[in-house]
């Protein structure tokens, strides 16, 4: 009983339940392959509980092991389009601080029009995650087709 | 020690660890694009701890943010079959109550024979999730090829 | 306050937060379709907290329901290569003890060069998971392209 009460009284953030699910806002300007994300209940089913957005990129607020997941669907796409524009590649990585820059997850579209994957990775407070889409095909902004999220799993 | 005892004494459900993993039972009748699911240890490695099945559709019992995941493999399929029968699309959404109806996750098969993805989404007690497979190709019922599940992540 | 203190004093392992993320070490010798994995901070972003490696295969240390995820990318691959070498298939399963041997997750590459999926499954202490890659194409050892992991979710 005491535990149940304590659990209710403690703010969720103190339990380390950081979580975010983002939807695509827009693609990058000149020579910037990054996707820019947005989140919040006013936009639909996206949210940030703990992590924050910094100019459309996701910044981590709590050290720990995270499950990172992403799905990106190309906007005008058939298997012939996808192969004609090959290579179209998506990479998720830590882009800042520069000292921790690393690619975490990489996928090519080949003859498909959607990529989806997930992985466990250690992240530290202040790490900013970037999602780079290289190639000439553009992503769909539908919230059920393109999304990006993280879930804190353990310290 | 006190915490460990308390944790053991509390039913898991009170910690909010709702989770389900389902296997395909059958496809819908004429004009019903929904897949019908089943779960339980007697069937293999599927289970429901918290959520329930309502006529083959998954109903949520606890408010919270959930990780929803799915994999569907087409039964008699090669890349040529898949492209010839295109478009074959899978959509996961809230189908009831009607006031909350929305598509959460959508994928097309294009030249592939399997789709797999996952996402974080808020769900409320009473939400029923439906998985609609549109097209003429049929899903495999092998439990390692086609499955659908949810995991409660946080309030 | 008491709960927060107790939580900090208890070793994480007692909370059941077993988790592992592995990177590819090498493929098996002749007639052995298994992939051999490695993990540890010295190797990059892979780690084992609870589960262990037994001759490159992942052994579970705690009973429970786990989220199992995998991504495998073929090393020298285009959609034409993938279709020419078809079928290339990846299967994740319990390979020992023999009495519990079962396939948990199966995917074919068809015309793609990457597969990625995840599922919830009950696992028991002592279960060893094997990942079998059948076909003539070889997997990439890049840590952002090929990885395999498990996360304890609940008892």
């Amino acid at each position: 009983q005491r535990f149940a009460q304590a659990q209710q009284q403690l703010p969720l953030e103190s339990l380390g339940w950081d979580v975010a699910e983002l939807q695509l806002n827009h693609t990058g300007p000149q020579q910037d392959p990054r996707l820019y994300w947005q989140g919040g209940p006013a936009l639909g089913r996206s949210f940030l509980h703990g992590p924050e957005l910094d100019k459309g990129q996701l910044r981590i607020h709590r050290d720990g092991i995270y499950m990172v997941h992403i799905q990106v669907t190309l906007a005008i796409c058939s298997s012939t389009t996808a192969s004609r524009h090959h290579p179209t590649t998506l990479a998720v990585g830590i882009c800042s601080p520069a000292s921790r820059s690393i690619s975490l997850l990489r996928l090519s579209f080949h003859q498909g029009c959607t990529i989806a994957s997930q992985r466990l990775t250690p992240l530290a407070r202040g790490d900013t995650l970037c999602t780079n889409l290289t190639g000439t095909l553009l992503p769909s902004r539908n919230t059920d087709e393109t999304f990006f999220g993280v879930q804190w799993v353990r310290p | 020690q006190r915490f460990a005892q308390a944790q053991q004494q509390l039913p898991l459900e009170s910690l909010g660890w709702d989770v389900a993993e389902l296997q395909l039972n059958h496809t819908g009748p004429q004009q019903d694009p929904r897949l019908y699911w089943q779960g339980g240890p007697a069937l293999g490695r599927s289970f429901l701890h918290g959520p329930e099945l309502d006529k083959g559709q998954l109903r949520i019992h606890r408010d919270g943010i959930y990780m929803v995941h799915i994999q569907v493999t087409l039964a008699i399929c090669s890349s040529t079959t898949a492209s010839r029968h295109h478009p074959t699309t899978l959509a996961v959404g809230i189908c009831s109550p009607a006031s909350r109806s929305i598509s959460l996750l959508r994928l097309s098969f294009h030249q592939g024979c399997t789709i797999a993805s996952q996402r974080l989404t808020p769900l409320a007690r009473g939400d029923t999730l439906c998985t609609n497979l549109t097209g003429t190709l049929l899903p495999s019922r092998n439990t390692d090829e086609t499955f659908f599940g949810v995991q409660w992540v946080r309030p | 306050q008491r709960f927060a203190q107790a939580q900090q004093q208890l070793p994480l392992e007692s909370l059941g937060w077993d988790v592992a993320e592995l990177q590819l070490n090498h493929t098996g010798p002749q007639q052995d379709p298994r992939l051999y994995w490695q993990g540890g901070p010295a190797l990059g972003r892979s780690f084992l907290h609870g589960p262990e490696l037994d001759k490159g295969q992942l052994r579970i240390h705690r009973d429970g329901i786990y989220m199992v995820h995998i991504q495998v990318t073929l090393a020298i691959c285009s959609s034409t290569t993938a279709s020419r070498h078809h079928p290339t298939t990846l299967a994740v399963g319990i390979c020992s003890p023999a009495s519990r041997s079962i396939s948990l997750l199966r995917l074919s590459f068809h015309q793609g060069c990457t597969i990625a999926s995840q599922r919830l499954t009950p696992l028991a202490r002592g279960d060893t998971l094997c990942t079998n890659l059948t076909g003539t194409l070889l997997p990439s050892r890049n840590t952002d392209e090929t990885f395999f992991g498990v996360q304890w979710v609940r008892p």
């Epitope: 300007p29 910037d32 906007a75 005008i76 553009l138 | 009607a98 006031s99 109806s101 929305i102 | -």
Partner: nanobody, 129 residues
């Protein structure tokens, strides 16, 4: 509905220059990207250059450093400046627009996007001495 009008094609000597224009009229606020494709005789249509609504550009390897795509938002026009032209650049050049239309659907007011490609009628570029 969007309409596209192309101009600027013609005959030019190797090493010469041309500037193609493509003017869009209609619902120009929903343009996601504009591009130029080329189709040489007996070959499939291939992307030459693309510019997104965010200003990002992409070029085919064969034209990098020679062709420049630009966009004048005030005139709703996309340009392709073609320099150092080669005989192998001879082709019909098509203007392409990726159109993103938005609708609010369903009981929760879900915003949905529909994507559509619109093509111009093509303009012939011949590079020959």
């Amino acid at each position: 509905q969007l309409q596209l009008v192309e101009s600027g094609g013609g005959l030019v000597q190797p090493g010469g220059s041309l500037r193609l224009s493509c003017a869009a009229s209609g619902n120009i606020f929903s343009i996601y990207a504009m591009a130029w494709y080329q189709q040489a005789p007996g070959k499939q249509r291939e992307l030459v250059a693309q510019i997104t609504n965010a200003g990002s550009t992409n070029y085919a390897d064969s034209v990098k450093g020679r062709f420049t795509i630009s966009r004048d938002n005030a005139k709703n026009t996309v340009y392709l400046q073609m320099n150092s032209l080669k005989p192998e650049d001879t082709a019909v050049y098509y203007c392409n627009v990726l159109h993103e239309s938005t609708e609010v659907a369903g009981p929760v007011g879900e915003k949905r996007y529909t994507y559509q490609e619109i093509w111009g009628q093509g303009t012939l570029v011949t590079v020959s001495s």
